[in-house]
């Protein structure tokens, strides 16, 4: 392993898994890496094995429990470790204190569906995944649509400041194609982030009607 | 080899302060995340808080508000400032180092403690 400057992220998804990217300057050849997840009250410790996402980084997922359980709470440290194998040994190559409540990125809303459609409008709902019952409805959102000639880095954004998994668009134009993604957040955390976005959904609004001619 | 050496403790007031000191010697040059932990009589040690090489800071639930961690990188000194301190902050310190990153720079260390108590 050929020393560089590293950075190591990890954010939790409120409930049993707890995911991370490493990232180092100097290339690791042909070297097996590990993160070793250890919290300082429970009886349990986890590991994953890091794969390589490009040229200096790696990535892992710490599969905690099902998907629905309750792994760890506000209280909860864990010390997450990256270890590389040398030889016989283990190297520990960059340390976490992590409060998993602290960096929280939830997984992305899921089951997106249009409930009604009309020339100018759509109706959308949508549904969060293994997010924690903690949060209540302390929940935000972001969403944005796809026009017909735009990117999604065009769109703009639209921001639902509490826990509403539905959307009314306006303003749409008749008989066109677009797309709908969202993405959620808790209030909670320093340093917690955005989910990644959802899958697009697909949808086109409804022919104007035609002009009656006299 | 990596030495640590806690100091500050003493008898204090509830609602009174104290300045924990831990002085590290040994691989100074190392990345290391420094920890403070604390054991009360009868009761397992406690994570207290940490602070990275990246000067990440990291409190238990218990002493966030209260307590703040801080390090003197010239001096290689440990600080653990406690305020507003309660009856439940008495116990034992210890000072732990943990390096990381190169291979000459592995391993975990502890100090000897120092007492604290409070008194309501």
């Known amino acids: 392993a050929v020393n560089g400057t590293s950075q190591f992220t990890c954010f939790y998804n409120s409930r049993a898994n707890i995911s991370c990217v490493w990232s180092q300057d100097g290339a690791l050849q042909d070297t097996s890496c590990q993160v070793h997840a250890w919290p300082d009250r429970r009886r349990w410790n986890q590991t994953c094995e890091l794969l390589p996402v490009s040229q200096a980084s790696w990535a892992c997922n710490l599969i905690l429990g099902a998907p629905d359980s309750q792994k760890l709470t506000t209280v909860d440290i864990v010390t997450l470790r990256v270890l590389c194998r040398e030889g016989v040994r283990w190297r520990v190559m960059a340390i976490q204190d992590f409060k998993p409540f602290e960096n929280l990125r939830l997984m992305a809303p899921i089951s997106l569906q249009v409930v009604h459609v009309e020339t100018h409008r759509c109706n959308i709902s949508w549904e969060i995944s293994q997010a924690s019952h903690y949060f209540e409805r302390h929940l935000e959102f972001e969403a944005r649509t796809l026009s017909p000639g735009h990117t999604w880095e065009e769109a703009p954004l639209l921001t639902l400041k509490q826990k509403q998994e539905w959307i009314c668009l306006e303003t749409l134009t008749p008989d066109t194609q677009y797309e709908f993604q969202v993405r959620v957040k808790p209030l909670q955390g320093e340093f917690t982030t955005w989910s990644p976005w959802s899958q697009p959904l697909a949808f086109r609004t409804k022919p104007a009607a035609l002009g009656k001619d006299t | 080899q990596v030495q640590l050496q806690e100091s500050g403790g003493g008898s204090v007031q509830a609602g009174g302060s104290l300045r924990l000191s831990c002085a590290a010697s040994?691989?100074?040059?190392?990345?290391?995340?420094m920890r403070w932990y604390r054991q009360a009589p009868g009761k397992e040690r406690e994570f207290v808080s940490s602070?990275?090489?990246?000067?990440?800071?990291v409190y238990a639930d218990s002493v966030k508000g209260r307590f703040t961690i801080s390090q003197d990188n010239a001096k290689s000194t440990l600080y653990l400032q406690m305020n507003s301190l309660k009856a439940e902050d008495t116990a034992t310190y210890y000072c732990?180092?943990?390096?990381?990153?190169?291979?000459?720079?592995?391993?975990?260390?502890w100090g000897q403690g120092t007492q604290v108590t409070v008194s309501s």
């Open positions: 732990q180092r943990e390096l990381y990153g190169d291979s000459w720079c592995q391993g975990n260390y």
């Open positions: 602070i990275n090489s990246d000067r990440r800071t």
């Open positions: 040994g691989s100074t040059s190392c990345s290391s995340v």
